[in-house]
């Protein structure tokens, strides 16, 4: 199974001799997840033409995927550490149902999909330790998640491929925005 960052001293993303700080661990963890997404996107792009689809086609798929906006305080303009951290954690919690959906969507990268899901859970725990304002973090309702999952799995093949592509692309974007923001904290 894929090794989580920090479990293997040979991990190239951590060339430090001294123990990693909390911020470095989080940074390394996000980069590990992004590497996993990269592998999943490669499989998705190889088996369908979704990666070259226009934004208009993507917009037809009415997924309510978490997205960073100016008001979330994670961009350079209007940067706000507390607001941003809440948005990152809330967004990751919202992505969990979509990561669950991805679990049966890959053949050669099945383990990678599981690693991305498990690593995201660990990342949420890291970030919750860092957050002061945990009260502001809303966790999605399990029943809502269950019905969403059922709905996504009932789509036709083309829509499922599109959904997979869109989840991966959006999760990549969200993590990269998070990474940039966390580096300012």
């Amino acid at each position: 199974a894929p090794v989580l960052p920090g479990e293997d001293s040979k991990d190239v993303a951590a060339p430090h001799s001294q123990p990693l700080t909390s911020s470095e661990r989080i940074d390394k963890h996000i980069r590990y997840i992004l590497d996993g997404i990269s592998a999943l996107r490669k499989e998705t792009c190889n088996r369908s033409n979704m990666c070259e689809s226009s934004k208009e086609a993507l917009a037809e798929n009415n997924l309510n995927l978490p997205k960073m906006a100016e008001k979330d305080g994670c961009f350079q303009s209007g940067f706000n550490e507390d607001t941003c951290l809440v948005k990152i954690i809330t967004g990751l919690l919202e992505f969990e149902v979509y990561l669950e959906y991805l679990q049966n969507r890959f053949e050669s990268s099945e383990e990678q999909a599981r690693a991305v899901q498990m690593s995201t859970k660990v990342l949420i725990q890291f970030l919750q330790k860092k957050a002061k304002n945990l009260d502001a973090i809303t966790t999605p309702e399990p029943t809502t998640n269950a019905s969403l999952l059922t709905k996504l799995q009932a789509q036709n093949q083309w829509l499922q491929d599109m959904t997979t592509h869109l989840i991966l692309r959006s999760f990549k974007e969200f993590l990269q925005s998070s990474l940039r923001a966390l580096r300012q904290m």
Epitope: P15, K28, F75, E173
Partner: antibody, heavy 123, light 107 residues
């Protein structure tokens, strides 16, 4: 092949405005971060501004913050830099650059550069 | 803001020599450092990204090392076409910052 072609440079008076454009071709533009870098005559490189793929997230150098605005039109494969309240120290060649890799980018690095467009701010 | 200190600013050398340029960050930038080569009248060219990864098409005599705050670009066996100005760039956090540049020239 990948091509980045800048336009819109020229001579402008202090306090004036210019809009630079960068036409991109040979790659899926919407998948890539794009950046403007400038170089004053006889000086080194200076990072100016970056815009990310779909998030609308932008970043600026302190020297241009509040005066310059970066934007992109993914449908037209074009990157823009709106420059207002121009100062003499903004005189430089402005390069449009593409960030490494479209599928995953945690590492910054500019793998393709346009030929640059000259901006001269003088009275 | 993270400051980048590149040294030396000028490096008189001879063809065939091994050349080392260093870049120091004012705080840790992990491995988010890239190196560029610029010849007079030309656009910059990416040599190294991620501190040590060689960009496609770049000769293997170029290598990068380091992480955290200290980074090095090495040219093993300088060739005439390598005479240029070299810049490092921190891409860890905004505002991103280039080093001041190192001009590699003949003695």
């Amino acid at each position: 092949q990948v091509q980045l072609v800048e336009s819109g440079g020229g001579l402008v008076q202090p306090g004036g405005s210019l809009r630079l454009s960068c036409a991109a071709s040979g790659f899926t533009f919407s998948n890539y971060y794009m950046t403007w870098v400038r170089q004053a005559p006889g000086k080194g490189l200076e990072w100016v501004s970056s815009i990310y793929s779909f998030s609308g997230d932008t970043a600026y150098a302190d020297s241009v913050k509040g005066r310059f605005t970066i934007s992109r039109d993914n449908a037209k494969n074009t990157l823009y830099l709106q420059m207002n309240s121009l100062k003499s120290e903004d005189t430089a060649v402005y390069y449009c650059t593409r960030n490494l890799g479209g599928v995953v980018v945690t590492t910054n690095g500019y793998d393709y550069w346009g030929q640059g467009t000259q901006v001269t701010v003088s009275s | 803001d993270i400051q980048m200190t590149q040294s030396p600013s000028s490096l008189p050398t001879s063809l065939g020599d091994s050349v080392t340029i260093t870049c120091q960050a004012s705080q840790s930038i992990s491995d988010e450092l890239s190196w560029y080569q610029q010849k007079p009248g030309q656009t910059p060219k990416l040599l190294i990204y991620g501190a040590s990864k060689l960009q496609t098409g770049v000769p293997s005599r170029f290598s990068g090392s380091g992480s955290g705050t200290s980074f090095t670009l090495t040219i093993s066996g300088l060739e005439a076409e390598d005479l240029a100005t070299y810049y490092c760039l921190q891409g860890y956090s905004w505002p991103f910052m280039f080093g001041q540049g190192t001009k590699v020239e003949l003695k």
